[in-house]
Interface confidence: low
């Protein structure tokens, strides 16, 4: 189930996945809910540790049985991912920070009369991640109401410092507030050219293009479909990037999907998540668990409801089924996509619903009847 | 270091550089201050020298061109180069250096920590390669020690860049699709170091690539966690410590 | 400036034997697999020898094994051919070469000496 | 041990033709292959490594193509200065030459 409460002067011990520098527990716990292992996460406050490399370090955990030892650190905060809490999913991150500045790759600089502005810039700015900006009272001049556009490889800071008379903040993009607008379109048999940031699996090109729209990095995205020539690169979706924001150049390539990340979407962005079912699909990854359901509706609940669980497959084949009942086989990577998709298999797969933000679960929502 | 930047005094600590003074001296390959007493780098440093006499390992330095005959350096007790590197093959290429006299640790000089043994899971955001080798493929060695931040990339990923070669688990590479920032000539030996939770750790000792920072054509290094065992074992000194650093 | 310079060549009666060098500057010529690469005069290229960056390692072309040595002493930075067996078809002009970057033990070659003739005739 | 079998052999042209030279290897060396320009009395000159990779500093003119057996080297407008003689070498299994395609004025 979902797990709001946030420990305080408790640091978990171990089970370590990634770490990064985070502004404050609430961020740090943002991060944990979007990434594919995490389920716990301890954050160390500047005033809760000397070593200055390990303040603001923000360390995601993972663990098989869903905790880990909890050790007494004064001023150190830690939690539980929010991926089962429904409502309460969310990339968007508006705090401002005061007093601290946000390392990174600084692609911009101007003159701004506010961090309201300065903010609102690198929400309207293709490649910006976070910002920082130095006040009127900052101690140099010369710098005084810069604004800093940036960007890092892993769209957190690379460092955070305190600094006096500085403020940063992060892009409001994920909350949908972009004045960018995206293209929605789905562009079939074109290939985009540019740096590739990541490559995952996956069985079509709208989930390939959700993944985009979460990645730090990616603005846009080709997927090679599964009739692809090259056997090895079949189902890969490869989320890129380039200095412009946009494709450098796209090839008319038979059996690609290409399109843009909706980040950059006014309004509205796509769920987390992915719903939708692929029958004859097998989806391989590590084994988490093997549970005999009654269809694959509710294969995909169980998976939803296992926190650790990414995606399942469903087997229809005889040996796999028990009168009304089949093997639920839930499973994990990871990068949270499929190790492998065969298909022409007697069954079905997806994915886990457990980041898709309409859920009942959250313990902070009242759920109001339709009238 | 091709497409990288001047490091700064203290800032990685732990790299130093591999000379070979025979008529003149010259800077050949980097390396890893893992100990007191001991040096991590590459096998293929020593390809056709393999005399301890000639060497010089200058640690705490920043600049090439501050050397002088003054400046003090460690000179090898013993070269233990892998028992299964071979000099026509990429693999095992992993060299440990044993010092005449043990090192004190300064802000300047201090070893780096070691991964854990096998460390697969582990997932690094935060890599650097640093040394003083050529800034492109037909350069010259660089006086001021260079940094360059490089991703990980997969084995699987590697491997396709390399069809002709065989990348094993025992290496990791680095580099971006587009090229542009690599290790090259003269890095050899040296560290790539990724930082995570807060600490830094040897992920890797440069080895080898295709030209330097060409697309598609990342960097190849010696997976160090692959050689804890190894390095364990080399280490030990007689009264059963490990003289090197390794993470709590 | 990087710069290979053979010397050793010249005029030998068949069955005699003849030393040639390969002297190496610029460079760190100890990282390097050198070649020796011949060419007879109106004829291609032929590749004749390679010794790996150790001198552990040494690869001969067919017309050559068992007659030349490849050998290197890596403190002169200098490369050495010597041939013995001398048949009138070694005639040629020998060229010392390496690549200087790329992925080691395995590439083509960029750099090459100015060559040195050797005539084998009575 | 792979042989490399160059076509033609001597090649007339002109001043802006666009000349392509073949080599064939007599077993898959993959795209292990670089193309040579050699003139009269001087040491080869390295122009195209790894089938088509150009070497630094060779003019674009010069472009390389193929994989496992079949490979060809295209010079787009033949210049003055590209009058010379061309060499394929395979270095897949240590190294072997091609015969060498003369390029001559028409």
């Known amino acids: 189930g979902c797990l709001t409460q946030l420990y305080e002067n408790a640091f978990f011990r171990g089970g370590d996945v990634a770490s990064m520098y985070t502004p404050n527990a609430q961020y740090c716990q943002m991060r944990c809910t979007f990434h594919p292992r995490c389920l716990l996460f301890s954050f160390l406050p500047a005033s809760s540790i000397n070593d200055m490399e390990k303040r603001f370090g923000c360390f995601l955990k993972d663990s098989v049985t869903g905790t880990l030892p909890k050790v007494h650190r004064t001023g150190a905060v830690s939690g539980h991912s929010l991926k089962q809490c429904g409502h309460q999913i969310s990339a968007c991150h508006r705090d401002i920070y005061k007093g601290v500045d946000m390392r990174g790759v600084n692609f911009n600089v101007s003159k701004v009369s506010s961090v309201e502005e300065c903010q609102k810039r690198c929400t309207s700015n293709i490649r910006c991640q976070f910002f920082s900006y130095a006040t009127q009272t900052f101690h140099k001049a010369e710098y005084r109401n810069n604004c800093l556009l940036k960007y890092s490889p892993g769209g957190t800071p690379t460092a955070i410092k305190v600094l006096s008379n500085v403020e940063s903040g992060f892009s409001l993009k994920p909350c949908a507030l972009s004045e960018i607008g995206c293209h929605m379109n789905i562009f079939q048999h074109l290939a985009f050219s540019d740096v590739d940031v990541a490559r995952v699996l996956t069985p079509d090109a709208f989930v390939c293009r959700t993944i985009c729209t979460y990645h730090p990095n990616c603005l846009f995205f080709t997927f090679y479909t599964n009739v692809w020539k090259i056997e090895s690169q079949r189902n890969v979706c490869l989320l890129k990037t380039s200095e412009s924001g946009t494709p450098s150049s796209s090839t008319p390539q038979e059996n690609t999907i290409s399109g843009y990340s909706l980040l950059t979407c006014k309004r509205t962005l796509p769920e987390p998540c992915h719903s939708k079912i692929y029958p004859g699909v097998d989806f391989g990854g590590e084994e988490l668990n093997v549970t005999f359901v009654k269809g694959v509706n509710v294969c995909q609940e169980t998976c939803t409801k296992m926190i650790r669980c990414q995606f399942f497959t469903y087997s229809l084949l005889p040996e796999d089924c028990k009168e009304e009942k089949c093997k639920c086989f839930l499973r994990l990577s990871m990068d949270g996509s499929p190790t492998r998709i065969a298909y022409g298999t007697q069954g079905s797969s997806g994915y886990s619903l457990r980041l898709c933000n309409t859920g009942d679960n959250s313990v902070c929502t009242t759920k109001t009847s339709t009238r | 270091i091709v497409g990288g930047t001047n490091s700064s005094w203290g800032e990685w600590p732990w790299q130093v550089s591999l000379q070979v003074k025979l008529t003149a001296q010259r800077h050949l390959c980097g390396g890893s201050l893992i100990g007191h007493q001991w040096v991590l780098t590459a096998a293929h440093c020593f390809d056709g020298l393999p005399l301890q006499d000639v060497w010089r390992i200058y640690s705490g330095i920043l600049n090439l061109s501050d050397i002088t005959k003054d400046t003090p350096f460690s000179q090898i007790k013993e070269i233990i180069i892998h028992q299964n590197y071979k000099v026509s093959e990429g693999n095992h290429d992993i060299a440990l250096i044993k010092l005449q006299a043990p090192l004190n640790y300064t802000e300047f000089q201090k070893p780096i920590c070691l991964p854990s043994k096998g460390d697969t899971s582990t997932i690094y955001t935060n890599c650097w390669v640093t040394g003083w080798g050529f800034s492109k493929e037909k350069g010259e060695i660089q006086n001021i020690l260079q940094k360059v931040n490089i991703p990980l990339v997969t084995n699987e990923e590697c491997q396709k860049r390399y069809q002709d070669y065989k990348i094993t688990q025992r290496m990791v590479c680095a580099g971006y699709k587009e090229g542009g920032k690599d290790a090259c000539k003269g890095d050899s030996g040296g560290p790539l170091v990724c930082k995570h939770n807060g600490m830094w750790r040897l992920v890797g000792i440069t080895s080898w690539g295709e030209g330097c920072a060409r697309r598609e054509q990342p960097g190849v290094y010696t997976k160090v966690a692959e050689y804890m065992d190894w390095i364990l074992e080399k280490t030990q000194s007689s009264d059963g410590k490990a003289q090197m650093q390794s993470p709590a | 400036e990087v710069q290979l310079l053979e010397s050793g060549g010249g005029l030998v009666q068949p069955g005699g034997s003849l030393r040639l060098s390969c002297a190496a500057s610029?460079?760190?010529?100890?990282?390097?697999?050198m070649m020796w690469v011949r060419q007879a005069p109106g004829k291609g290229l032929e590749w004749v020898s390679g010794?790996?960056?150790?001198?552990?390692?040494?690869v001969y072309a067919d017309s050559v094994k068992g007659r030349f040595t490849i050998s290197r002493d890596n403190s002169k930075n200098t490369l050495y051919l010597q041939m013995n067996s001398l048949r009138a078809e070694d005639t040629a002009v020998y060229y010392c070469?390496?690549?200087?970057?790329?992925?080691?033990?395995?590439?083509?070659?960029?750099?090459w000496g100015q060559g040195t003739m050797v005539t084998v005739s009575s | 041990d792979i042989q490399m079998t160059q076509s033609p052999s001597t090649l007339s042209a002109s001043v802006g033709d666009r000349v392509t030279i073949t080599c064939r290897a007599s077993?898959?060396?993959?795209?292990?292959l670089a193309w040579y320009q050699q003139k009269p009395g001087k040491a080869p000159n390295l122009l195209i490594y790894?089938?088509?990779t150009l070497e630094s500093g060779v003019p674009s003119r010069f472009s390389g193509s193929g994989s496992g057996t079949e490979f060809t080297l295209t010079i787009s407008s033949l210049q003055p200065d590209d009058f010379a003689t061309y060499y394929c070498q395979q270095y897949n299994t240590y190294w072997t030459f091609g015969q060498g395609t003369k390029v001559e004025i028409k």
């Open positions: 010794i790996y960056s150790s001198g552990g390692i040494t």
């Open positions: 077993q898959s060396i993959s795209s292990w």
């Open positions: 070469a390496y690549r200087r970057t790329g992925v080691p033990r395995r590439d083509a070659f960029d750099i």
């Open positions: 610029g460079f760190t010529f100890s990282h390097y697999i």
């Open positions: 790894k089938a088509s």
